[in-house]
């Protein structure tokens, strides 16, 4: 796997341990927590990042679930099980044998159950809505300039192909970024929208996952764009399965 050869670090994931023990003395980096080898030329999967984060735990965060089929990460941090490719396993269980099914971004999509719970497949999150509120500014940002800046950011910083940024909406002070990526659209080597959204979320919170790169400095025509609130909604290819009790809560 590629990494910065001169000082053997992983530019795209600071939560790694790197050493020149790859083929031909090449730099090889392994994710903390899982020990899995990571490709430092692209984003690391959210599952491996969460696992690494749990090996050095911080305060869990809680978000609000907004609507019927859109999921929000209400459960905060957990230590996930990842498959050999670094994706979330469809079924996740905690140390007390409580299990639940997750989608491809690791967000719970069923009620919690016991070890008998079956999760037949990993359901893909094909639509992510990132809802931001920016701090007050002298005037509204120019919509086209803001739209282009956010599209550029996802291309350049997260290596997300421009075709996966479906839309950028703006009604001051609310910005919405829509990411869409169906299973059929995602080619080998394409960054997953879930991974890009997670890196963006961490950047916005001032917790950049990149090694040796400055934090996110978002500017629109030189004017700083400072985000004061972020909500991320996840829509799956198959709607989630929660009991009526939860839906009416």
């Amino acid at each position: 796997h590629t990494a910065a050869q001169d000082n053997c670090t992983c530019p795209t994931n600071k939560m790694t341990v790197c050493s020149p023990d790859g083929p031909g003395g090449r730099c090889q980096c392994r994710a903390l927590g899982s020990g899995m080898a990571v490709d430092c030329s692209t984003l690391t999967s959210k599952c491996l990042l969460l696992k690494a984060r749990m090996s050095a735990p911080k305060n869990a965060r809680t978000l609000v679930r907004p609507s019927e089929h859109a999921l929000v990460d209400n459960d905060g941090l957990y230590d996930p099980d990842c498959d050999p490719e670094g994706r979330f396993k469809a079924r996740q269980c905690n140390q007390t044998s409580v299990c639940w099914c997750v989608n491809s971004v690791g967000v719970r999509r069923t009620d919690k159950g016991d070890l008998s719970l079956r999760c037949d497949e990993l359901v893909r999150t094909h639509h992510i809505l990132i809802d931001l509120r920016h701090r007050p500014t002298a005037g509204a940002f120019n919509h086209s300039d803001l739209d282009a800046e956010l599209r550029r950011l996802f291309r350049e910083r997260y290596r997300l192909h421009p075709k996966f940024v479906a839309a950028v909406h703006y009604e001051q002070p609310t910005i919405q970024i829509e990411l869409r990526q169906n299973t059929s659209q995602k080619a080998a080597g394409d960054v997953d929208i879930g991974d890009a959204a997670y890196y963006f979320e961490r950047d916005i919170k001032g917790e950049s996952l990149f090694q040796g790169r400055g934090g996110l400095d978002l500017r629109v025509r030189g004017e700083p764009l400072q985000v004061e609130r972020t909500l991320i909604y996840y829509l799956d290819e198959i709607p989630p399965k929660f009991s009526m009790k939860r839906l009416t809560a």
């Epitope: 086209s144 282009a148 291309r155 350049e156 997300l160 940024v165 839309a167 950028v168 500017r219």
Partner: antibody, heavy 117, light 106 residues
């Protein structure tokens, strides 16, 4: 095979406008970005701006804002760059280039625009 | 705007020589891109992400650096390498290029 084929050379008078075309083939047009770069004779490369072909989102550099218009016709997979109020210093080769997760991965052959009275 | 300054502006070298071109950014950038341009032709992507060779680019080309200082190296010059080389950033709008380094035959 990815190809960007640009329109032919143009000679314009100061104050006039020029519209350069860039016809794309070999890829899904609306999935990408087309950027425009110019190069004055014997000089370096200067970025003008870019258009996101799927959404129509455009970013122009401050220097060209108000004078440049970028458009795209998805039915013919053609991008256009129009520059108005031409002056002699706009004499240059204008390139279109495709953008993806790279700023420019494939380039057109260039269009020479000469501004002369 | 991020300014990119290439050094040297021009360079005379012989076939087989090792050549190094540097690019200095006025503020930190994520990655650097390098292009090769021959007279009358469009630029061609040579190196992306500071150090990764674009498809079909010979291994005698290499790139390194991070932050504000980047380098393009040609380990053993070949006749077809005599051209002008540009660095370019897109870490922020507007995208900017270095002024170019013209590599000539000695």
């Amino acid at each position: 095979e990815v190809q960007l084929v640009q329109s032919g050379p143009e000679v314009k008078k100061p104050g006039a406008s020029v519209k350069v075309s860039c016809k794309a083939s070999g890829f899904t047009f609306t999935d990408y970005v087309i950027g425009w770069v110019r190069q004055a004779p014997g000089q370096g490369l200067e970025w003008i701006g870019e258009i996101y072909l799927g959404s129509g989102t455009i970013y122009y550099t401050e220097k060209f804002k108000g004078r440049v218009t970028m458009t795209a016709d998805t039915s013919t997979s053609t991008a256009y760059m129009e520059l108005s109020s031409l002056r002699s210093e706009d004499t240059a080769v204008y390139y279109c280039a495709r953008g993806s997760i790279f700023p420019f991965d494939y380039w057109g052959q260039g269009t020479l625009v000469t501004v002369s009275s | 705007d991020i300014q990119l300054t290439q050094s040297p502006s021009s360079l005379s070298a012989s076939v087989g020589d090792r050549v190094t071109i540097t690019c200095s950014a006025s503020s930190s950038v994520s990655y650097m891109y390098w292009y090769q341009q021959k007279p009358g032709k469009a630029p061609k992507l040579l190196i992306y992400d500071a150090s990764t060779l674009a498809s079909g680019v010979p291994s005698r080309f290499s790139g390194s650096g991070s932050g504000t200082d980047f380098t393009l190296t040609i380990s053993s010059l070949q006749p077809e390498d005599f051209a002008t080389y540009y660095c370019q950033q897109w870490s922020s709008y507007p995208y900017t290029f270095g002024q170019g380094t013209k590599l000539e035959i000695k």
